[in-house]
Every structure is written in C-alpha cells, then in structure tokens.
Interface confidence: low
C-alpha cells in the first residue's frame, strides 16, 4: 500500500535569465528512494540515483545543475521554460510517486518565488 505523499514548491515564478530551484520532498513512507527523475512534459531533464548519483540529459547539461539534495536547479531561464515539471520518485517497495510543479518565467522583475516548504 502506498502511504507516502509528495510535497512540492507548487506554482512558482522566476525572472527571465535567472535561476530557480525545483524541489520535491517525499514523506509519510518508509519506502527507500532508489531514483528520482525530473521531467518537463515528456522530456527527461535529469536523474538522481540514490547510489549512482546524477545523470543530466545531454541537451540540458549547460542549463541544469544537480541539487540541492534531490532537487534540480534550472539556470539561464527563458520564457520557453514556462510549463509543468514533474519529480518522479521511484521507491522500493512502494513504487512510483509523482509531484507536479508549475513554473512561470516572467519578462519583468516582479517574479515571486513561492515555496511550500523550506529548501534544505
């Protein structure tokens, strides 16, 4: 039975040219996280494996940095980065948990960074 829940930074906004941290946190389960996939719509951005570390997709390696923790840092943001991002937690023995973040990249300097929990 899957008892866990995913907390995310929710809907966030950031300024064009800046950077943003995408963060998810899995709680309420004793399942072991074996891997976290970060995806943008149907594109794989990065993978963090509990034992084997990070794999950044080649097409994103100049703009994506691993961490902090199991999170992902997006750099040199463009308006085209606006959209849905998913953290997919592969766990054992529970299975897969998915969290959703919506990022809006703004042209102006009035972007606000929303967060539902403290980023470690």
């Amino acid at each position: 039975m899957m008892t866990g829940t995913i907390e995310t930074t929710g809907n966030i906004s950031a300024e064009k040219g800046g950077s943003i941290i995408l963060q998810c946190h899995l709680s309420s389960t004793t399942a072991q996280v074996t891997q976290v996939n970060w995806e943008q719509q149907d594109q794989l951005l990065a993978i963090c494996n509990a034992d084997l570390g990070w794999h950044i997709s080649p097409s994103f390696k100049d703009r994506v940095a691993p961490g902090p923790g199991l999170g992902l840092t997006l750099q040199s943001l463009t308006v085209n980065d606006t959209g849905e991002y998913f953290c997919i937690y592969h766990t054992y023995p529970d299975g897969t948990y998915t969290g959703r973040i919506f990022l809006e990249v703004l042209e102006s300097s009035v972007a606000e960074h929303g967060a539902r929990f403290q980023i470690p």
């Epitope: 034992d51 084997l52 570390g53 990070w54 950044i56 080649p58 390696k61 691993p66």
Partner: antibody, heavy 118, light 107 residues
Framework: QVQLVQSGAEVKKPGASVKVSCKAS????????MHWVRQAPGQRLEWIGY????????KYNEKFKGRATLTSDRSASTAYMELSSLRSEDTAVYYC???????????WGQGTLVTVSS | DIQLTQSPSSLSASVGDRVTITCRAS?????MHWYQQKPGKAPKAWIS???NLASGVPSRFSGSGSGTDYTLTISSLQPEDFATYYC??????????FGQGTKVEIK
C-alpha cells in the same frame, strides 16, 4: 557510436600495482557512471566499484576497498582503475562498463588482461 | 551480499530446441539483468530489467520472473546463441553481483 577502449595487457609481480584506463567516446562522458568489473579465468563476473564522472563520487565493493582506486579525467573522457598490493588471485580480465539508468551495463570495454606472476 | 545461482551451469542443446536458464537470488532483488558472453569477448547487455531485450537481441529471447526467481528463455535455439549467459542483480545496496554463468553448448 559508443565505444569504451581499454589499455593493453599487463604483467605484474605480486605486491605491485596496476593502473588500467578506459577511454570513452560517442557520448557525453560525465553523464554516465562508469563501473569496473573483473573476471578471473573460469570464474563469474565480479563487481569492483564505480565512479560517477559528474562529481567524482565513488563506491566500492567492500572486498576491494583500500586496494582499488577509481578516478576519472573528464577532459580526456577517461576512467581509471588502479589496484594495489597485487596477488596471484588478482589475475583476471578487467572491464569498464557504462551504467544505464535502468541499473544495467549497456556498453563494455574490450577488457584488459592483468597477469600477476612472480 | 546477495548470491545468484544459475541452473544449469552448462547445457547441451540442438538448433531449434527451447532452452530455459534460471537464476535464483538468495534474497529478493529490485532488478535482474542478463548478459551474453562469447569466448574471448566482453559481455553484452542482453536483457534488462527482467524482460526488456537489448537493442539487436532477437525476439526468440525472453525474460521473466520476480522476487528471487528469474528465467531467460530461448524459444528456438540458433547457432549464434551458443554462448555463456550471466544474470546480474541490482538491489538497493551494493555489491551488485552476477551468477556463475550458464554455458550453452552444441549437442
């Protein structure tokens, strides 16, 4: 196409060290973890450890801890495996193997025969 | 460490035969993979994550299993299939181990 090319065969005396190289091409070296596996004559494959070239993180089989050292040179797209205090039972073919996301090794080097003999 | 035991260790079969190789783990594993190795050559990825055929592997090969028991099956053995097959497990904690191999020989 992905290729892993290893250094040539080595003959070493007991107590010596050996350093085997594995040059990767056809992909972005730092995006994939590199493992090392050995196969003694007529024996099963044995996992030695891995290095993650992205951050130089390593993990070793406890059996090889303290004797095996894994390093990488991102600028040369090359991984290295050094084994010290060699003994006759270290005679084996040593392979580098690229780790895939689904926890298996999709490409292997051609192997390097290390012979330990007095 | 998780021990993998393959059976049989070797087998003799004829072209066209159905061949089944089993791999039993000493405790439950997350993933099981299979490799093919020919004499003097490096292993090749053959089946990943229990049942996914690697690129270029013929559809006469299949894999199945869960928990501690896994199988590789060749539905109709062909001359190029004569080789040694190894299972390999991935579980949460290393070391990641291999079976002792099953040598498929011509009868």
């Amino acid at each position: 196409q992905v290729q892993l090319v290893q250094s040539g065969a080595e003959v070493k005396k007991p107590g010596a060290s050996v350093k085997v190289s594995c040059k990767a091409s056809g992909y972005t070296f730092s995006n994939y973890v590199m493992h090392w596996v050995r196969q003694a004559p007529g024996q099963r494959l044995e996992w030695i450890g891995y290095i993650n070239p992205y951050n130089d993180g390593t993990k070793y089989n406890e059996k090889f801890k303290g004797r095996a050292t894994l390093t990488s040179d991102r600028s040369a797209s090359t991984a290295y495996m050094e084994l010290s205090s060699l003994r006759s039972e270290d005679t084996a073919v040593y392979y580098c193997a690229r780790w895939r996301v689904n926890y298996y090794f999709d490409y292997w080097g051609q192997g390097t025969l290390v012979t330990v003999s007095s | 460490d998780i021990q993998l035991t393959q059976s049989p260790s070797s087998l003799s079969a004829s072209v066209g035969d159905r061949v089944t190789i089993t791999c039993r783990a000493s405790s439950s594993v997350n993933y099981m993979h299979w490799y093919q190795q020919k004499p003097g050559k490096a292993p090749k990825a053959w089946i990943s994550v229990t049942s996914n055929l690697a690129s270029g592997v013929p559809s006469r090969f299949s894999g199945s299993g869960s928990g501690t028991d896994y199988t590789l099956t060749i539905s109709s053995l062909q001359p190029e299939d004569f080789a040694t097959y190894y299972c390999q497990q991935w579980s949460s904690n290393p070391p990641w181990t291999f079976g002792q191999g099953t040598k498929v020989e011509i009868k």
